[in-house]
């Protein structure tokens, strides 16, 4: 117990979640694919989340979907459409702490 | 305080034209879209045009595809519906409204809207 | 394009009812829904964003909630000033679509 004890206060004291760059603005055209990236580092290793105008990202197979990447996480929408407009926000949490970055695709 | 007021609404014959202004104060115009929004008597709400003024991002309904203008002047604080071709079932009360900081389509501030009549 | 289908269309209520409305998305639009309240000769106000959000200084009898497609505004204990016509609104596909209206009449 009093080791389990030492390596918890060790990752407390080393834990943090750092968002690296902020997101870009996209604009592109109809039916092109459109990439926007998350860069987030953290530890423990961040969860992060992908919303779209204040809604969880809905996931279209072969057409929309995200992914981790070694920088945090990456949204890729392909055949774009106007309906896809819109404020895109990732959240990433390491279970402590809570960052996010914003970035509008037009 | 957020604000917006509309004008320029009146009687107008058919194949008519009008220019809508949308005059916002409270808030930094250039960081948020403006849709303009209609509502024909007796009717729901109607969604017309909208504009990111920051970005240049213009987006119509089919309605008033190629007969409608949306623009902006940042300078001015005032989003403008250019309408022309005008017809008779354009006759509504046009409003103007704000986006939210983190949604594109969620409208949390409204003018008091201006009313539009199409007829000879 | 995305259909909103709310309904009903019209109700009667009496003071203190609690009332229920429901819109149902044609497709998924997560958790993206607005409501707005309009009152005769004034513009719409914003009431519930996100499904379930309730906007600064909206009355807590008023909620809304989310199963699949289909969306819900609550008022749980109707008020004189409540009476009045609501639309739901999708707000995860651009440009948002509306329902077409329920209005809360006296009864």
């Known amino acids: 117990p009093t080791s389990s004890w030492n390596i918890s206060s060790e990752l407390n004291k080393d834990s943090y979640l750092t968002l690296d760059e902020p997101m870009n603005n996209i604009t592109t055209s109809l039916g092109q694919t459109a990439e926007l990236h998350c860069k987030v580092s953290g530890n423990p290793p961040p969860t992060i989340r992908w919303f779209k105008n204040d809604a969880p990202v809905v996931q279209e197979p072969r057409r929309l979907s995200f992914r981790s990447t070694i920088y945090g996480s990456r949204l890729r929408i392909r055949n774009l459409d106007t309906t896809d407009t819109g404020y895109f926000q990732c959240v990433a949490t390491n279970g402590k702490e809570v960052v996010s970055s914003t970035g509008v695709l037009f | 305080e957020v604000q917006l007021v509309e004008s320029g609404g009146g009687l107008v014959q058919p194949g008519g034209s009008l220019r809508l202004s949308c005059a916002a104060s409270g808030f930094t115009f250039s960081s948020y879209g403006i849709h303009w929004v209609r509502q024909a008597p007796g009717k729901g709400l109607e969604w017309v045009a909208y504009i990111h003024s920051g970005i240049g991002y213009t987006i119509y309904a089919d309605s008033v595809k190629g007969r409608f203008t949306i623009s902006a002047d940042t300078s001015k604080n005032t989003a403008y519906l250019q309408m022309n071709s005008l017809r008779a079932e354009d006759t509504a009360v046009y409003y103007c409204?704000?986006?939210?900081?983190?949604?594109?389509?969620?409208?949390?501030?409204w003018g008091q809207g201006t009313l539009v009549t199409v007829s000879s | 394009d995305i259909q909103m289908t709310q309904s009903p269309s019209s109700l009667s209520a009496s003071v203190g009812d609690r009332v229920t409305i429901t819109c149902r998305a044609s497709q998924s639009v997560s958790s993206a829904v607005a409501w707005y309240q309009q009152k005769p000769g004034k513009a719409p106000k914003l009431l519930i964003y996100?499904?379930?959000s309730l906007y600064s200084g909206v009355p807590s009898r008023f909620s809304g909630s989310r199963s699949g497609t289909d969306f819900t505004l609550t008022i749980s204990s109707l008020q004189p000033e409540d009476f009045a016509t609501y639309y739901c609104q999708q707000t995860y596909w651009s440009p948002g679509t509306f329902g077409q209206g329920t209005k809360v009449e006296i009864k």
């Open positions: 409204a704000r986006t939210s900081s983190t949604s594109t389509s969620v409208m949390d501030y």
């Open positions: 996100s499904a379930s």
